[in-house]
């Protein structure tokens, strides 16, 4: 891979010196380094109106290196780019710009959002939740006996948390009314969450509507429609007392 002699050969500056500083193989008083020692990269640094040659172990920020057979050379990335693979492809943008497909942008394109940690434009990620798990046993104050009406709960997991612009997560907990065949608690059964129970179908007028549990909003983003003001809650409590069905609401 020998370099063929170009038509325009570099003329050595009159003040070429062999006793050069820091990594230079040849240098001049006016231009600094003209060539570098093996494995070092040659870069041109602008100082005022003139360019000075320097020899470095690796290319500085805003430059990329090419290892030619006869010279290791640093080339400037585009102005808005901090690290690049070559002239066409940036791999890290300067502050205030977002990286998208090798380019540095002020704002991310439609359908993408800015990741302020990586400073890259990324796909919008929507919330994903699993299927509901089965309903829990019907309980009241942690017991599965000694009562007629209780509550049962079911949960689902968040599989994918949403990104900043993604769709919010729906509730991950639901609680609903349930009824059991009233039975006396056996000795030692008090407070024990049993598995066996008979679930009675709700009486006419009794609601078995599942309501998202208050806990669900701690693990997912709250949807505005699910918020209830104090008056609505009071109103609901009155209606529920009339129906003799208690319903847990979202707070």
């Amino acid at each position: 891979q020998n370099a063929s002699r170009g038509r325009r050969q570099r003329r050595m500056h009159p003040n070429v010196s062999q006793g050069c500083q820091g990594g230079c193989a040849t240098c001049s008083d006016y231009n600094g380094c003209l060539s570098c020692k093996p494995r070092l990269f040659f870069a041109l640094e602008r100082i005022g109106m003139k360019q000075i040659g320097v020899c470095l172990s690796s290319c500085p920020s805003g430059y990329y290196g090419t290892r030619y057979p006869d010279i290791n050379k640093c080339t400037k990335c585009k102005a808005d780019c901090d690290t690049c693979f070559n002239k066409n492809f940036c791999t890290k943008c300067k502050s205030g710009f977002y990286l998208h497909l090798g380019k540095c942008l002020d704002n991310c394109p439609e359908g993408l959002e800015a990741n302020n940690h990586t400073m890259e434009c990324v796909s919008i990620v929507h919330c994903e939740v699993s299927e509901w798990n089965p309903w829990s046993p019907c309980t009241k104050k942690g017991k599965t006996c000694g009562f007629k009406r209780g509550t049962e709960t079911r949960v689902r997991e968040i599989i994918q948390h949403p990104s900043a612009k993604g769709n919010l997560c729906p509730p991950t907990n639901e609680t609903r009314k349930c009824t059991v065949q009233r039975k006396k608690c056996q000795k030692g059964e008090r407070g024990k969450k049993g598995r066996e129970r008979k679930r009675k179908k709700p009486n006419k007028g009794e609601s078995k509507e599942a309501i998202p549990d208050s806990k669900s909003l701690e693990s997912s983003k709250e949807i505005p429609e699910q918020r209830e003001n104090k008056q609505q809650q009071k109103k609901r409590k009155v209606q529920d007392k009339q129906k003799s069905v208690s319903v847990s609401t979202v707070h």
């Epitope: 891979q1 370099a3 063929s4 170009g6 038509r7 325009r8 050969q9 570099r10 990329y64 090419t66 290892r67 030619y68 057979p69 006869d70 693979f85 070559n86 002239k87 066409n88 492809f89 791999t91």
Partner: antibody, heavy 116, light 107 residues
Framework: EVQLVESGGGLVQPGRSLKLSCAAS????????MAWVRQAPKKGLEWVAT????????YFGDSVRGRFTVSRDNTKSTLYLQMDSLRSEDTATYYC?????????WGQGVMVTVSS | DIQMTQSPASLSASLGETVSIECLVS??????FVWYQQKSGKSPQLLIY???RLQDGVPSRFSGSGSGTRFSLRISGMQPEDEAEYFC?????????FGAGTKLELK
């Protein structure tokens, strides 16, 4: 839109010469090192030569060094490959490419057949 | 010169199947590594640069990984338009060298 259009290919006898040209448009030609990459029929890619952006230095693959020369005219945005002492093993499609560590832009290629 | 060992030489995949191509490099090249795709009768096109970064217009089912001496290209869900030859290249130093290629066919 970036365009690289090669020309000058054809059938040539062993030992003879051929000159390929590549007309570039859609990018700043004088900013880029330019290269020739070839591909023999049903074979892989082989780098042939690169000339740096200002034409002052050129590099060649072992198989063509001393026989091929590369030049460019930045005023015409054109790259050239002068191929002398051609051999049958030089038979290939020759691609003109913008070479900046990777080969970012490619021409459609031109076929060179060396046969008696 | 840096040697590139690409495998397999050919590969047949069903629609939707995940495919992997590997390239081993004779010396540490950090992430100065590129993948190209060449469809039948066409010129090669840059697919992935800097080992893992997708060129504009390349579908997200393509991904590149690796650093140092071992690199791979993965297609998650083979599509008819992915039928092509794939080449790796080291961009670490001169002379630029290519892998021998992997011909990917649709079953």
């Amino acid at each position: 839109e970036v365009q690289l259009v090669e020309s000058g290919g054809g059938l040539v006898q062993p030992g003879r010469s051929l000159k390929l040209s590549c007309a570039a448009s859609g990018f700043t030609f004088s900013d880029y090192d330019m290269a020739w990459v070839r591909q023999a029929p049903k074979k892989g890619l082989e780098w042939v030569a690169t000339i740096i952006y200002d034409g002052s230095r050129a590099y060649f693959g072992d198989s063509v060094r001393g026989r091929f020369t590369v030049s460019r005219d930045n005023t015409k945005s054109t790259l050239y490959l002068q191929m002398d002492s051609l051999r049958s093993e030089d038979t290939a499609t020759y691609y003109c490419t913008a070479h900046d560590r990777s080969f970012d832009y490619w021409g459609q290629g031109v076929m060179v057949t060396v046969s008696s | 010169d840096i040697q590139m060992t690409q495998s397999p030489a050919s590969l047949s995949a069903s629609l939707g199947e995940t495919v992997s191509i590997e390239c081993l490099v004779s010396e540490d090249i950090s992430n100065d590594f590129v993948w190209y795709q060449q469809k039948s009768g066409k010129s090669p096109q840059l697919l992935i640069y800097a080992a893992s970064r997708l060129q504009d217009g390349v579908p997200s089912r393509f991904s590149g990984s690796g650093s140092g001496t071992r690199f791979s290209l993965r297609i998650s869900g083979m599509q008819p338009e992915d039928e092509a030859e794939y080449f790796c290249q080291q961009s670490y130093k001169y002379p630029p060298t290519f892998g021998a290629g992997t011909k990917l066919e649709l079953k």
